[in-house]
């Protein structure tokens, strides 16, 4: 008899789930000389221990410790990239300049990028039917509460200057309701962090306004001020030269117009 | 030394086609927004079209949309104009312009041009 | 689109003299303009962009000063070679658009 399953309004798990986060462990691992160490399969049962069998609208962010503490890393002072709104960028910046880290560019940010996932209360089963959403069913589900669990540590263990990529083409710049206005933010140490340096990445050639005047970069500025934190801002007017300039740095014309 | 060299101007009838060229050398092309601005005879200048660094985006001057199309070959270091049904108000010297291209900085001006091309429409 | 208009469209001034272009938009371009040099026969040359700031290679008697709407281009001492046509052009929006030009010739 197929038993009642609770329908929620997200998409379900990601298929092959276990699997997908077993492979991009063993990968991670492989490629990352200094998480070697890491044992993917504890990685896993920690990772299905912070969910499954729980009530999906209740998970906690001490759920997830066992995991955050197996994928403890650091990243070097100066190195750190938080990002709002503009993902690919932030990785296709990464994926260049190899020196700096995107949340994930760190194993636990490599291992959920992307995907989707819930289990049942009382049951050892994961749901590929449907997940709660944030906005329509519950903050408090497994994905969300990963991601803020993990972005509150990624912002805790920053240090030197931080950098953040925002999104100029939309209409609040700086949203104090993204994981980075309502989490990273306010997880920054004052004594560790020197200062935060927001990109403003333009959309086009069409744009040729001052975006580190607006009102949202304004408001970012005061809340980083306010922590003892110095805040600059630089206009990204040409996101595709900004690129193809960490890709070939020496060239005449990546150095003027600074 | 930056250098930009127009080609393909000359007399063609209303209604014809004409296809400029203009030859870059002396800095990495593929890193430079890059424009065409004309100048008919005794008058003043008129932007024309610009194409951002990989031809992702083009621009035109309302005078030109849709008749002319403008692209580059960043292999060849080589900017184009295609000119379609065009018109005696075309008449003028075409000229080659390289745009800064700030990252940091807004930019849309011209920092170097070509010595120009004329093109002539008339039957 | 913005429209430009420079005045006078004709100076006569003698060499040695100070001599003052003005541009006018009809909507704020805030910084975002250029002025031009033109010679007969020749392609413009770049002298001043983000209204005030000087190219490269030329020479400090050009100045640029404005923003928003009004902008003026100040050459503090004519010299032989400085007589040609002027033209402002503003980059803050799409078309960008150039003024008619000025015609600095000698008295």
């Known amino acids: 008899v197929p038993r009642w399953r609770q329908q929620w309004s997200g998409s379900g798990t990601t298929s092959r789930f276990p699997e997908t986060v077993l492979a991009r462990c063993v990968k991670y691992t492989e490629v990352h000389p200094e998480m070697r160490h890491v044992d993917c399969q504890s990685v896993w049962d920690a990772f299905k221990g912070a969910f499954i069998s729980k009530y999906p609208c209740n998970i906690t962010e001490e759920d997830y410790q066992p995991l955050v503490k197996l994928g403890t890393q650091t990243v070097p002072c100066n190195k750190t990239l938080l990002w709002s709104r503009i993902k690919d960028l932030a990785h296709q910046f990464t994926q260049v300049q190899r020196d700096m880290f995107t949340l994930e560019d760190m194993l636990l940010g490599y291992l959920a990028d992307d995907l989707t996932w819930c289990g049942e209360f009382n049951t050892f089963e994961i749901n590929y039917q449907s997940c709660p959403d944030w906005r329509k069913d519950c903050s408090n589900n497994p994905v969300s509460v990963f991601w803020k669990t993990v972005s509150r540590r990624f912002a805790e263990t920053a240090c030197g200057v931080v950098h953040v990529m925002l999104n100029g083409s939309r209409s609040k710049i700086f949203d104090k309701n993204s994981t980075f206005g309502s989490v990273e933010v306010h997880n920054l140490q004052p004594e560790k962090v020197q200062a935060l340096e927001a990109w403003v990445i333009h959309g086009g050639r069409e744009d040729s306004r001052d975006l580190c005047q607006d009102p949202t970069i304004k408001e970012l500025e005061s809340i980083i001020s306010k922590r003892n934190i110095r805040f600059f801002c630089k206009n990204i007017y040409r996101p595709d030269k900004f690129l193809q300039c960490v890709k070939n740095p020496e060239d005449s014309s990546c150095l003027s117009g600074i | 030394e930056v250098q930009l060299l127009e080609s393909g101007g000359g007399l063609v009838q209303p209604g014809g086609s004409l296809r400029l060229s203009c030859a870059a050398s002396?800095?990495?092309?593929?890193?430079?927004?890059m424009s065409w601005v004309r100048q008919a005879p005794g008058k003043g200048l008129e932007w024309v079209s610009t194409?951002?660094?990989?031809?992702?985006?083009?621009y035109y001057a309302d005078s030109v949309k849709g008749r002319f199309t403008i692209s580059r070959d960043n292999s060849k270091n080589t900017l184009y104009l295609q000119m379609n049904s065009l018109r005696a108000e075309d008449t003028a010297v075409y000229y080659c312009?390289?745009?800064?291209?700030?990252?940091?900085?807004?930019?849309?001006?011209?920092?170097?041009w070509g010595q120009g091309t004329l093109v002539t429409v008339s039957s | 689109e913005i429209v430009m208009t420079q005045s006078p469209a004709t100076l006569s001034v003698s060499p040695g003299e100070r001599a003052t272009l003005s541009c006018r938009a009809s909507?704020?371009?805030?910084?975002?303009l250029a002025w031009y040099q033109q010679k007969p026969g020749q392609a413009p040359r770049l002298l001043i962009y983000?209204?005030?700031t000087r190219a490269t290679g030329i020479p400090a008697r050009f100045s640029g000063s404005g923003s928003g709407t009004e902008f003026t281009l100040t050459i503090s001492s004519l010299q032989s070679e400085d007589f040609a046509v002027y033209y402002c052009?503003?980059?803050?929006?799409?078309?960008?658009?150039f003024g008619q030009g000025t015609k600095v010739e000698i008295k």
């Open positions: 983000g209204a005030s």
């Open positions: 002396g800095f990495t092309f593929s890193f430079y927004d």
């Open positions: 312009a390289r745009d800064p291209s700030y990252i940091y900085s807004t930019s849309g001006y011209f920092d170097y």
């Open positions: 909507q704020s371009v805030s910084s975002n």
């Open positions: 194409i951002t660094l990989h031809g992702g985006d083009t």
């Open positions: 052009q503003q980059y803050n929006n799409w078309p960008w658009t």
